[in-house]
């Protein structure tokens, strides 16, 4: 175009519907110029105007010829332009921030603006740029893009931004612009102008302030603190660590903490100091709640449910910032909150939830929440299967009879719909405890009763009880122990009885043993002894316990002696024994040796012995009647070990084995023996009966049984040359090759002739006895042989 004609035609649109075209006027033209603008379209359109721009409806795709005729005082000039959408620029109108507000507690800015979408014909994507500036110097803090869509109507947009610095610390400015990314427009697209700026500031009072206050943040986060002050701030510390100051407007300063460490439970102080003062805030750095661990729900009483859990990792937040828990039951919609006052016991938290009528299945969700986040755990329980009964209380024992008792106890709760399995521990003194399981129907009123039989009369029992439900979840704790003595019953057996004739053979002495407690069935008060023959029965006076012996004057006829034990309830069956022994002529005395503690006796089975066997023993050296003790063994036995605290090593005892038939006893074997053999305590006394030139005759005596201390097995006789009162070695000293030893194993031998000796020579003689328990001491003598004749 010529300079004297309109030139530099440019078209822009702000809404894609109208193009605003403008051009430069021909040089030299003044105010009074008119223009004719013709657009070569399907229809030829011309417009008369007095200004250098024209708004035309947006042209569809393609090239259009635009003729601009300039009419002025000194003539006219015409310019032709080709116009295409591609030459048109899309520049949106300058946006306007409708509202900028702040939440100072969260340091968040809230922005509100209108996209004026109603003026656009198509749906288009819009890119917004939001600029955040800080301080009076308007330092750029953040430039963000935000995408929206135009949808044919005016839409209000909201955007928020959380500042890393508390908003109180400095003035914050915000401005926005937009860019319409229309797919239907092929021309140039450009950013709008920036909106008029809006700002947010905090109006300080005269007091110095530190921000943020009481902030709770995640461990490892970064955080900015500031001090709004009229006086110069000299230093800042977190805990006791100095931090570099960041200068803001005026005397205001900030500090930035990176990767903050976990706080003490009371928080961490952030302190700013001035010449004369100190100002602080507290930061609580911790963790969001961990997922509640080991959530478990049970009931003690089917009235309320107890849910327990472990909080997991500690949050380091306490007091008002501590984790709060809510237990929600989803079927009923009911919930309970955990009160912080209910401090956890041993790291485990618990909540009670009231059971709901006719609801057995509960779906619990435990929500954990603190200022840093939330978490949850869920559990589905059939509560009838999760009964952990209370400890049974008011546990009582009452007698039914001598072998049965009634146990009662209290178990709080409404258990009408379930059965209990209860375990009763029964302990007899000094014996192993027994456990019995009983199934009991649950009741509403909490009182339970059970009968316990198969007990022993007159026995001290200790009872305790615990219960679980039949479906078994947990045993209750054991109840308190209750000690109880069952009532007496008639003694179940007669006493173990034996008899001996007195040494003069005129009196029969009857002995019996106290009944063991499990047969006495009570405290034995007395004994009745009676004596009967074919002609008569004679009863002795009642013999009070603890006397266990009676003497009756009897002739040598056969009598049956009866002994009956009596307690407060009644009398035992009689124990019967014949006064006379069944004779046995075919008896030899045998030797037996024990095993240190006792002695094993064996015998052959005898089918004639129908009642029992009795082993009787006594100390051999004691006078008649020979009775130390006796032991009864069943008739089918062929051996027994006799043990007694009274047995001593080296003491000889007589043992007698009797067999019984029809209450009469026959002596089957007679034995002498030792529990343990020892060496003799003395040497045999010996004398020289005769001396010749070449021989000596020695004679010795028996060693008394008490000193022998075992069965005599032989003698050791030593002889050799030797003189009294000389330094020559004694016979038994080692290393002598001229000493001779004779081992005499024939214990009936009482003399010994030593031959082949030298005449008129002194000999040293030594004699020792030995048993299987060892060799006894020595007895020695010096003898001089006669001179050879």
């Amino acid at each position: 175009q010529k300079k004297g004609a309109p030139h530099d035609l440019k078209c822009v649109t702000n809404n894609l519907q109208v193009w605003d075209c403008y051009w430069k006027a021909p040089s030299g033209t003044g105010r009074g110029t008119d223009y004719e603008v013709c657009i070569e379209n399907r229809s030829h359109s011309c417009y008369q105007l007095e200004k250098t721009n024209i708004k035309i409806p947006a042209l569809s795709h393609g090239d259009y010829e635009i003729t601009i005729n300039s009419l002025h005082d000194f003539g006219s000039s015409t310019s032709k332009f080709t116009l295409n959408e591609q030459n048109v620029s899309l520049i949106p109108d300058t946006p306007e921030i409708l509202n900028l507000s702040a939440d100072f507690s969260t340091s968040t800015l809230y922005l509100k603006w209108n996209d004026r979408g109603s003026v656009f014909p198509h749906h288009s994507n819009v890119i917004w740029e939001i600029k955040i500036l800080r301080k009076e110097s308007m330092e750029l803090v953040k430039l963000v893009t935000h995408n929206t869509t135009l949808n044919g109507k005016d839409t209000l947009h909201h955007w928020s931004w959380a500042s890393d610095m508390p908003l109180e610390c400095a003035i914050h400015f915000v401005e926005i612009r937009c860019y319409i990314d229309s797919l239907h427009f092929s021309g140039r697209k450009e950013w709008s102008d920036w909106s008029p700026v809006k700002n947010i500031s905090w109006m300080p009072d005269s007091q110095t302030k530190v921000f943020p206050q009481d902030k709770v943040i995640l461990v490892g986060s970064d955080i900015t603190f500031c001090c709004i002050s009229q006086e110069k701030v000299l230093s800042a510390l977190i805990g006791h660590t100095n931090c570099p100051l960041i200068h803001l407007d005026g005397e205001n300063v900030a500090i930035k903490i990176h990767n903050i460490s976990v706080s003490a439970s009371s928080g961490t102080n952030v302190v700013f100091t001035t010449e004369d003062n100190i100002f602080g805030t507290v930061i609580f750095a911790g963790y969001p709640p961990d997922t509640p661990q080991q959530l478990n729900c049970e009931t003690h009483d089917l009235k309320e449910i107890l849910c327990r859990w472990n909080p997991g990792r500690a949050t380091a937040l306490v007091g008002p910032r501590a984790t709060s828990y809510t237990l929600l039951e989803s079927f009923s919609g009911k919930y309970v909150r955990f009160k912080r006052a209910e401090a956890p016991t041993n790291g485990s938290y618990q909540l009670f939830f009231q059971m709901l009528p006719n609801q057995e299945i509960y779906n619990f969700t435990l929500n954990a929440h603190n200022p840093l986040g939330r978490s949850e755990s869920t559990i589905l329980v059939n509560i009838t299967e999760k009964v952990y009964p209370h400890t049974p209380t008011s546990f009582k024992v009452k007698d039914i009879n001598s072998t049965a008792v009634k146990l009662s106890w209290h178990l709080p709760g409404n258990f009408a719909k379930i059965n209990f399995l209860c375990q009763i521990e029964i302990k007899k003194s000094n014996t192993v405890q027994e456990q019995r399981n009983v199934t009991i129907k649950g009741v509403e009123n909490s009182s339970y009763l059970v009968a316990l039989d198969k007990l022993n009369p007159y026995t001290v029992y200790t009872f305790r009880i615990r219960c679980s439900t039949e479906t078994f979840w947990k045993w209750s704790k054991w109840s308190n122990k209750k000690q109880h003595l069952t009532t007496e019953a008639i003694p179940s057996k007669g006493p173990d009885t034996w008899r001996e004739w007195s040494s003069d053979g005129k009196n029969l002495i009857i002995y019996w043993k106290p009944l063991p407690i499990n047969e006495a069935n009570g405290k034995i008060l007395s004994y009745n002894v009676s004596c009967s023959s074919d002609e008569e029965t004679q009863s002795l006076s009642e013999i009070p316990d603890p006397q266990h012996k009676a003497e009756i004057q009897l002739d040598k006829n056969d009598y049956i002696i009866s002994v009956v034990a009596k307690n407060s309830v009644g009398s035992s069956p009689p124990s019967k024994i014949a006064s006379m022994e069944i004779p046995n002529d075919d008896l030899k005395i045998e030797q037996v040796v024990g095993m240190g503690k006792g002695i094993l006796l064996t015998w052959h089975y005898d089918p004639n012995m129908t009642c029992d066997y009795v082993i009787k023993w006594c100390n051999s050296s004691r006078s008649e009647p020979c009775l130390m003790d006796w032991r009864k063994v069943p008739s089918n036995s062929t051996e027994t070990v006799i043990e007694s605290d009274q047995f001593r090593p080296g003491v000889r005892y007589n043992f007698f084995l009797y067999g019984c038939r029809n209450q009469g006893y026959q002596l089957l074997r007679s034995m002498i023996g030792y529990i343990e053999e020892l060496a003799p305590t003395v040497a045999p006394n010996f004398t020289v009966e005769d001396t010749s030139a070449d021989s000596i005759l020695v004679k010795w005596e028996d060693i008394p049984v008490e000193e022998l201390r075992g069965f005599l097995r032989g003698y050791l006789f030593y002889f050799g040359k030797g003189e009294r009162d000389t330094s020559k070695m004694r016979v038994l000293e080692s290393g002598r090759s001229d000493i001779k030893v004779k081992n005499i194993t024939d214990i009936s031998q009482k003399t010994l002739r030593i031959a082949d000796l030298q005449g008129k020579t002194s000999y040293h003689l030594v004699l020792r006895a030995y048993t299987d328990g060892g060799v006894g001491p020595e007895k020695s003598m010096y003898v001089v042989t006669k001179e050879n004749s």
Partner: antibody, heavy 125, light 108 residues
Framework: QVQLVESGGGVVQPGRSLRLSCAAS????????MHWVRQAPGKGLEWVAV????????YYADSVKGRFTISRDNSKNTLYLQMNSLRAEDTAVYYC??????????????????WGQGTLVTVSS | EIVLTQSPGTLSLSPGERATLSCRAS???????LAWYQQKPGQAPRLLIY???SRATGIPDRFSGSGSGTDFTLTISRLEPEDFAVYYC?????????FGPGTKVDIK
């Protein structure tokens, strides 16, 4: 157990000086900020001064600024208050008090716990 | 400086009753920086509550603290004979550290 024992109180004439001491035991003295608090007869509590755990920073109430000096000797576990130019209105029981939490744990602004039994200062002509 | 006001000045109650003591600040105080002390005649003050609501070691749970901003409360749920004393609130968040004038709890 933690103990604070004040000493040095007494009767003094206006304009004169007095030095109070506070002997600390049962804790790591060098880890705690320390304070002086006073209580005029029949009146409430008035904070007087604080000194940081390391002795580097000291702060005072306006009523004593320029006249009183707080100091500490961490080797002797002792806190001091040097009181100069005493006035009748300084008459009070003077308590020393420890920060309730160690500076190493929580930092430098804390509640006061425990307190000493107090020492009476009487300023009178 | 932050001025603390306590009310009432005197509270006359009987043992077993509930006591509610108020402390108001002239400007906002961080709840982390508010403490309550008890003082009996002839004795040094004793810390009850710190951080507005945390009970000090050995303090019975009948004592509780609450509040934020400018209004704080000390509650004694059931007064015991040994609780009759003067109670002071204190802010320790900025110097000068200030105490309230005290509330005297006496036996009715």
């Amino acid at each position: 157990q933690v103990q604070l024992v004040e000493s040095g109180g007494g009767v003094v004439q206006p304009g004169r000086s007095l030095r109070l001491s506070c002997a600390a035991s049962g804790f790591t003295f060098s880890s705690y900020g320390m304070h002086w608090v006073r209580q005029a007869p029949g009146k409430g509590l008035e904070w007087v001064a604080v000194i940081w755990y390391d002795g580097n920073n000291k702060y005072y109430a306006d009523s004593v600024k320029g006249r009183f000096t707080i100091s500490r000797d961490n080797s002797k576990n002792t806190l001091y208050l040097q009181m100069n130019s005493l006035r009748a209105e300084d008459t009070a029981v003077y308590y020393c008090a420890r920060d309730g939490e160690s500076s190493m744990v929580r930092g430098l602004l804390n509640w006061f716990d425990p307190w000493g039994q107090g020492t009476l200062v009487t300023v009178s002509s | 400086e932050i001025v603390l006001t306590q009310s009432p000045g005197t509270l006359s109650l009987s043992p077993g009753e509930r006591a509610t003591l108020s402390c108001r600040a002239s400007q906002s105080v961080s709840s982390s920086y508010l403490a309550w002390y008890q003082q009996k005649p002839g004795q040094a003050p004793r810390l009850l509550i710190y951080g507005a609501s945390s009970r000090a070691t050995g303090i019975p749970d009948r004592f509780s603290g609450s509040g934020s901003g400018t209004d704080f409360t000390l509650t004694i749920s059931r007064l015991e004979p040994e609780d009759f004393a003067v109670y002071y609130c204190q802010q320790y968040g900025s110097s000068p550290f200030t105490f309230g004038p005290g509330t005297k709890v006496d036996i009715k």
